[in-house]
């Protein structure tokens, strides 16, 4: 008999080159593959659980950044005057929460943000929870 | 044939508000549908594998926070003299083992210490291996 | 029915006490249950996917240390003049790539560099994508 | 190939409203910051405006901040200049410039061919 | 604001010979991201400005190997070696590494 073989974990990989004052970062999925969507600049979440969560970015400014995942909630990461993040967390993310980038900058320019090596990965932890599609 | 669906993963989120000096800090779990139990204010480990651990708070007072896992072992997490943590740490854990908090401070204070936001969570990450219950 | 089981989670700890400057670290398995093998003094990569990270050690002299998975490729991990590491990362890691270490050092001693805890552990995030063994 | 295309430019009076347009072509638009930069006769050059990539950050030059205002429509490729209580002194051609794509700082890659705005009773 | 002086202001030189513009700004240009945003230009008489140069040495894309940018911290300097009648025009630096951007006032090059 063939064992039995995992179903595809939910998890997926965007990058950002460019962040947008007071908005958030431009985020693409650079694989078809990955078993999460981007919609509307947000990672969809469609499975209960706890998700590892690991950001990365050099930025051309400082700048304060925030990632949320549910209006009137507080962040999953919370950076303030910063001009690089290289952070790892866990957080328990539900159906219905919306993965999204807030950020903002106090300087003149009048350049988007440009971002070297941003890269958000979300992973999530327990498979076998409710899912709904 | 449905396909094969994953047994629960051994997952734990626990919530602290208080800790007491040369004691260690109060956990409740605040869901009932936890896959890890909580005894005599440890985690109890059921299965042997490699967990991610994860631990947020903000204290009252700076303290020294260490988290055990077993009687004679270095501890998996040690702070000293802070007033506040948020670290990710993987460790190896087995069977029997219980995770659990030592508290130290050095202020002449008689209260307990407070804790914002304090939470420890820990995902098995290895399943499909030994579990005894 | 027998509930179905998870098949193994390939995942590795390997420990290393020494480093050779302008090469690399030894590193050893203490189990021989891992479900990754070291060969060469790398760690060899079977499945594709997202592998969980963790890097930890004290080092007898300050060294700069990079861990790599593949020629041509950036570092998993950059440390640079460091005499500790305690860092924990997220990568996407493919078959044939090998995890390995480079070490160097400026100091004009002519012994190898020792290692108080040194382990890496690798846990893959992806069970049921593409291995080949 | 890049092109910057300016017009609206023309002869209005003191006190007097202008709106100046440039269609880009040839590049990711909504990539890249836009300015207009103005030349008045026999003078040097002068940066009077910039709007970022995603319409969210505007820079003015003192002389006409409060007067000027800078928008892009980014589904049409166009960045506008819209240009009240106009002065004597506001009298150059005002050129179009994309940014060059740079880290941090700034430079201007291409230039429109420039619209002449003179502003005289 | 950055001031940027180009000298001299106006220069003639003969077919085939080298010219030299110096620009001096009035404080560093060297950014926090350790790129200094120094830019030359040549404005063609009738013509809008072309970018020559970005950062003080790189050559824009079609721009001639006539064409070098040097210098650092305050002090810059183009050099056009091997003159030819089509480089007759303005040339202006202009400094990107604080806001505003600002132009030198420009150096007219004349070939006899």
């Known amino acids: 008999q063939v064992p039995p073989q995992y179903p595809p974990i939910q998890s997926i990989r965007v990058q950002f080159t460019r962040c947008e004052n007071e908005k958030g970062c431009i985020i693409t999925s650079p694989s078809k593959d990955e078993t999460m969507k981007v919609q509307d600049n947000s990672i969809i979440i469609n499975c209960d659980g706890f998700y590892l969560i690991s950001l990365k970015g050099y930025f051309s400014e400082e700048l304060s950044l925030s990632l949320y995942y549910r209006k009137g909630r507080g962040p999953l990461f919370s950076l303030s005057k910063v001009t690089s993040v290289d952070s790892i967390g866990v957080a328990y993310l539900a159906f219905k929460d919306k993965v999204y980038f807030n950020v903002t900058t106090h300087s003149t320019s009048y350049k988007d943000i440009q971002v070297n090596g941003g890269e958000l990965i979300l992973i999530h932890q327990n498979p076998g929870g409710f899912c709904a599609y | 044939q449905v396909p094969p669906q994953y047994p629960p993963i051994q997952s734990i989120r626990v919530q602290f508000t208080r800790c007491e000096n040369e004691k260690g800090c109060i956990i409740t779990s605040p869901s009932k549908d936890e896959t890890m139990k909580v005894q005599d204010n440890s985690i109890i480990i059921n299965c042997d594998g490699f967990y991610l651990i994860s631990l947020k708070g903000y204290f009252s007072e700076e303290l020294s926070l260490s988290l055990y896992y077993r009687k004679g072992r270095g501890p998996l997490f040690s702070l000293s003299k802070v007033t506040s943590v948020d670290s990710i740490g993987v460790a190896y854990l087995a069977f029997k083992d219980k995770v659990y908090f030592n508290v130290t401070t050095h202020s002449t204070s008689y209260k307990d210490i407070q804790v914002n936001g304090g939470e420890l969570i820990l995902i098995h990450q290895n399943p499909g291996g030994f579990c005894a219950y | 029915q027998v509930p179905p089981q998870y098949p193994p989670i390939q995942s590795i700890r390997v420990q290393f006490t020494r480093c050779e400057n302008e090469k690399g670290c030894i590193i050893t398995s203490p189990s021989k249950d891992e479900t990754m093998k070291v060969q060469d003094n790398s760690i060899i990569i079977n499945c594709d996917g997202f592998y969980l990270i963790s890097l930890k050690g004290y080092f007898s002299e300050e060294l700069s240390l990079s861990l790599y998975y593949r020629k041509g490729r950036g570092p998993l991990f950059s440390l640079s003049k460091v005499t500790s590491v305690d860092s924990i990362g997220v990568a996407y890691l493919a078959f044939k790539d090998k995890v390995y270490f480079n070490v160097t050092t400026h100091s004009t001693s002519y012994k190898d560099i020792q290692v108080n805890g040194g382990e890496l552990i690798l846990i893959h995030q992806n069970p049921g994508g593409f291995c080949a063994y | 190939e890049v092109q910057l295309v300016e017009s609206g430019g023309d002869l209005v009076k003191p006190a007097g409203s202008l709106r100046l347009s440039c269609v880009a072509s040839?590049?990711?638009?909504?990539?890249?910051?836009m300015s207009w930069v103005r030349q008045a006769p026999e003078k040097g050059l002068q940066l009077v405006a910039g709007?970022?990539?995603?319409?969210?950050?505007?820079y003015y030059s003192d002389a006409v901040k409060g007067r000027f205002t800078i928008s892009r429509d980014n589904a049409k490729n166009t960045v506008y200049l819209q240009m009240n209580s106009l002065r004597a002194e506001d009298t150059a051609i005002y050129y179009c410039?994309?940014?060059?794509?740079?880290?941090?700082?700034?430079?201007?890659?291409?230039w429109g061919q420039g619209t002449l705005v003179t502003v005289s009773s | 604001d950055i001031v940027m002086t180009q000298t001299p202001p106006s220069l003639s030189v003969s077919p085939r010979e080298t010219a030299s513009i110096s620009c001096k700004a009035s404080?560093?240009?060297?950014?926090?991201?350790?790129?200094?945003?120094l830019d030359w230009y040549l404005q063609k008489p009738g013509q809008s400005p072309q970018l020559l140069i970005y950062l003080g040495s790189n050559r824009f894309t079609g721009v001639s190997d006539r064409f070098s940018g040097s210098g650092s911290g305050t002090e810059f300097t183009l050099r056009i070696s091997r003159v030819e009648a089509n480089d007759t025009g303005v040339y202006y630096c202009?400094?990107?590494?604080?806001?505003?951007?600002?132009f030198g006032q420009g150096t007219e090059l004349e070939i006899k």
């Open positions: 202009g400094q990107g590494t604080q806001l505003p951007y600002t």
């Open positions: 709007i970022s990539g995603g319409g969210s950050r505007t």
């Open positions: 410039a994309k940014d060059g794509g740079s880290w941090a700082g700034y430079n201007f890659d291409y």
């Open positions: 404080q560093s240009l060297l950014h926090s991201d350790g790129s200094t945003y």
């Open positions: 040839g590049f990711t638009f909504s990539s890249y910051s």
